[in-house]
Amino acid sequence: FGISGKHFITVTTFTSAGNIGEDGTLSCTFEPDIKLNGIVIQWLKEGIKGLVHEFKEGKDDLSQQHEMFRGRTAVFADQVVVGNASLRLKNVQLTDAGTYTCYIRTSKGKGNANLEYKTGAFSMPEINVDYNASSESLRCEAPRWFPQPTVAWASQVDQGANFSEVSNTSFELNSENVTMKVVSVLYNVTINNTYSCMIENDIAKATGDIKVTDSEVKRRSQLQLLNSG
């Protein structure tokens, strides 16, 4: 590789989180090199012998891949020349969490960067008016969370109010015995007010808002991964 031993290239990774049972991405970029055949990408995981993934001479080389990653990884091959070494990971498991290294070698030089990969479960909450309840109440449900999150309610009108005394939260284990369904009910709600249900663990924070008026119900949800970037 000629000068590759003398020069270092910039490799950038982003701490990210994987949602178990879904696709995940380990993000890594590097200084582009138009010579695809001269690019080597190696993904390694701390504590694992063998490679997570290797891409060289324009194609995957899985000869040294650790068995736990077999059939579960791929680079975005068409984006390698523009400096994308990110790794696609199939069916994220809790055991995939850890420290990964993205190692790059090109005709310009070599470099590497680490990333922390967190795994868990997170999902959007949905808030509905609970018409079955004896008093006006709201029901906030989110299908999959792990580790167990905290749940808090807030109100636009009663800012700073503590709703823990007028809400009830339960966690129901899902069929795979890892993730849990989150259900929180807020009692004694008033009309013409916006309420927020906030679910948070160390991986993600999700918020569901609901505005109830005489004529309509408006909902909005958002999900934010924590400590990423």
Epitope: L62, G71, N91, S175
Partner: antibody, heavy 121, light 107 residues
Framework: EVQLVQSGAEVKKPGASVKVSCKAS????????IGWVRQAPGQGLEWIGD????????NYNEKFKGRVTITRDTSTSTAYLELSSLRSEDTAVYYC??????????????WGQGTLVTVSS | DIQMTQSPSSLSASVGDRVTITCKAS??????VAWYQQKPGKAPKLLIY???TLQPGVPSRFSGSGSGRDYTLTISSLQPEDFATYYC?????????FGQGTKVEIK
């Protein structure tokens, strides 16, 4: 265009073996998993196993373990399914299929035309 | 191994009907469920993968949804060319598994 062309129909006696071939073209053969699926007459689809041609790694349905071998020849871009100790219930159309996602084992997105294997005494 | 239980095994419907086919996984959670259409004497055709992603070239009347153990294929308005057998596939684990199939027939 991805193409998978399978070998012709076979008639075998019980206890014999059969080897079905699947020649791939239109993509990099060593970069995508190839799976095998069978369908008995009037029945549903049954997954047999798959192979990653780039390294020869295989996965098999427990039901067929010990009787089935999936191999590949990278020089001819061909995958093979060999089934031994044939019995009448192995009579089926055998399909090969490419798995989407390159080294990532995805769903089967391109299929061969099928090979009818008949087991009869 | 994960088994996929598909229902119904057959259904009769008319052109323009909304048709729903379900698959239930025996265990676990993952989004790796695909749906195939097969016509007599032909190889299966991939319609949907990763629960809800439409394969390029497949009409938008086909849609997939689901989570946990329950997955659904919906045909919003059945067309004459949609009369066929449909299969779900679980491909998230080491061992893949098909559902038993649903034959959609003309009423």
């Amino acid at each position: 265009e991805v193409q998978l062309v399978q070998s012709g129909a076979e008639v075998k006696k019980p206890g014999a073996s059969v080897k079905v071939s699947c020649k791939a073209s239109g993509y990099t053969f060593t970069s995508y998993w190839i799976g095998w699926v069978r369908q008995a007459p009037g029945q549903g689809l049954e997954w047999i196993g798959d192979i990653y041609p780039g390294g020869g790694y295989t996965n098999y349905n427990e039901k067929f373990k010990g009787r089935v071998t999936i191999t590949r020849d990278t020089s001819t871009s061909t995958a093979y399914l060999e089934l031994s100790s044939l019995r009448s219930e192995d009579t089926a159309v055998y399909y090969c299929a490419r798995l989407d996602g390159s080294s990532y084992r995805g769903a089967m997105d391109s299929w061969g035309q099928g090979t009818l294997v008949t087991v009869s005494s | 191994d994960i088994q996929m239980t598909q229902s119904p095994s057959s259904l009769s419907a008319s052109v323009g009907d909304r048709v729903t086919i379900t698959c239930k996984a025996s265990q676990g959670f993952n989004k790796y469920v695909a749906w195939y259409q097969q016509k007599p004497g032909k190889a299966p055709k991939l319609l949907i993968y990763y629960t809800s992603t439409l394969q390029p070239g497949v009409p938008s009347r086909f849609s997939g949804s689901g989570s946990g153990r329950d997955y659904t294929l919906t045909i919003s308005s059945l067309q004459p060319e949609d009369f066929a057998t449909y299969y779900c596939l679980q491909y998230g684990n080491l061992l893949y598994a098909f559902g038993q199939g649903t034959k959609v027939e003309i009423k």
